[in-house]
Amino acid sequence: EAHKSEIAHRYNDLGEQHFKGLVLIAFSQYLQKCSYDEHAKLVQEVTDFAKTCVADESAANCDKSLHTLFGDKLCAIPNLRENYGELADCCTKQEPERNECFLQHKDDNPSLPPFERPEAEAMCTSFKENPTTFMGHYLHEVARRHPYFYAPELLYYAEQYNEILTQCCAEADKESCLTPKLDGVKEKALVSSVRQRMKCSSMQKFGERAFKAWAVARLSQTFPNADFAEITKLATDLTKVNKECCHGDLLECADDRAELAKYMCENQATISSKLQTCCDKPLLKKAHCLSEVEHDTMPADLPAIAADFVEDQEVCKNYAEAKDVFLGTFLYEYSRRHPDYSVSLLLRLAKKYEATLEKCCAEANPPACYGTVLAEFQPLVEEPKNLVKTNCDLYEKLGEYGFQNAILVRYTQKAPQVSTPTLVEAARNLGRVGTKCCTLPEDQRLPCVEDYLSAILNRVCLLHEKTPVSEHVTKCCSGSLVERRPCFSALTVDETYVPKEFKAETFTFHSDICTLPEKEKQIKKQTALAELVKHKPKATAEQLKTVMDDFAQFLDTCCKAADKDTCFSTEGPNLVTRCKDALA
């Protein structure tokens, strides 16, 4: 229904706390360099204005669209051009072009320092002094670093943060209470960020149809007892929610997500038997819980997929009459039978089926042509299964750090032109798949591994788009989203690459490395490893292991030495010489 004042409608629906949080996220995602105080001031002004519209929907400007209201606020910021350069040109445009322009200027890799967690005592002090401001800082810092973070989910993580601080700040040993819990939230939030970015990429590059196909597959796996009409309704609603969030319409997105959660909980009987626990929770927890609810038990009496999609005499007729609906039912039926497949794989199978019908239905004897289509799925299914087996075996043998290093070598050989920080970040993220997925039961590994890898590779593609340097990466990133992972997996050593000159300073280290946290030490060593591969792309695994072991031994020795500086300055050059010899 149409509302006289959109802003009043959203304020009433969401309540002041969520309204303010979402406006803060929106501003932080659009203008990523502004300070918290600048954004907090704007949020307060918008909230005060929303309250006047709630009191009188006919008041001046209350009938304006949210894009107009928010855009006008952003464009009124002083020194916009000095701080944001050409983004300021967006302000010369009218809506909806102005919002599109803001979206295009979102930076997936803003040059902001890493979000450092304050010391436990300091954190608890500022949390106790002003919990609202503390949580505002959290929303601002995360949102500006992750401009496509799913806004209602970020409110959920802020709520988690709040609960952890409330609990741990009352304990004697705040540090040991906070660290593991906050690390857990951070890890989950980072995964949520790359997953959502993938959804927005799907929407931006391939449109709503592509996202809806993803949603149909995912929902059919989770809710195999829901009928096709129910799955289609959920997929349509979920597509709308994601389109809004990806498009910066965060108030509408959060409101519609709450509506969708309400609908699911009111219609559990026709959706799934597993929803009750989620539906008993308050809003943010409920929506989060529903988004990752366990798969319902598959119906026992599902007929073979071939009956309707291969053996039926009317396959081509049904396909001709309504292509999207027929392919949608195929995707639904295949997905509900295969919770053990990744969504990417299911979409590849649906694409193969569509291509087969396109070809076969134009022949004189279609059934003879498409009769073998299910057998032709076999190699498509085997490829990711082998990938999972090979990589999980390697992870179990090497552990997370060693597995990351193996991936780093592999990817540096595939795309040596890519910057070392990007390669290290990608390899570290890709390597986490082991810890995340390889410990799961067999039937959950494939969906976990492949869908996670796809999301990480999407980030690689986004970073590479900014400064394209590798033809290999461009080739894999230009295709469809579901083909990316197999494309990257199939890449081999880039034969066109001219090896980097050996620079001693790249491998020169100082005593300050000794005091770095373990994670930072690992990154330093992985940076050196990537540089070694760039110098010798065809170095054997044995050669690289020799060098890295020597390097680890060198660090260990010098960091234990009484005079660390002298050790680094005398032993360092010897290490460099040994490295050169080992790789000669």
Epitope: Y319, A320, C361, A364, P367, A368
Partner: nanobody, 115 residues
């Protein structure tokens, strides 16, 4: 919405000819193979002939081979069946269908071969 409308049937003496037409709409005609199927009184559906989307490949049931010719005009989105040397056993309702289907969702056209 997919529509298939057959025409050209009628009463004909054995040994004579008829040309059936099927006007198609509501789908990408050239992307689909098309078939003719028939149903004699009191019998089940019988496949008669098929043609590929481009018109380059054709298939015929043994019972009509050498007598019937299937063709199509993609520009006019129309399917044809030229029936020569008709026999009494060709008496049936003829339906055009999409793909190699034996379905009969259209109205059909009656062909009666009798002296």
């Amino acid at each position: 919405e997919v529509q298939l409308v057959e025409s050209g049937g009628g009463l004909v003496q054995p040994g004579n000819s008829l040309r059936l037409s099927c006007a198609a709409s509501g789908f990408t005609f050239s992307s689909f193979g098309m078939s003719w199927v028939r149903q004699a009184p009191g019998k089940g559906l019988e496949w008669v002939s098929s043609i590929s989307g481009s018109g380059s490949d054709t298939l015929y049931a043994d019972s009509v081979k050498g007598r019937f010719t299937i063709s199509r005009d993609n520009a006019k989105t129309t399917l044809y069946l030229q029936m020569n040397s008709l026999r009494p056993e060709d008496t049936a309702v003829y339906y055009c269908t999409i793909g190699g289907s034996k379905s009969r969702s259209s109205g059909g056209t009656l062909v009666t071969v009798s002296s």
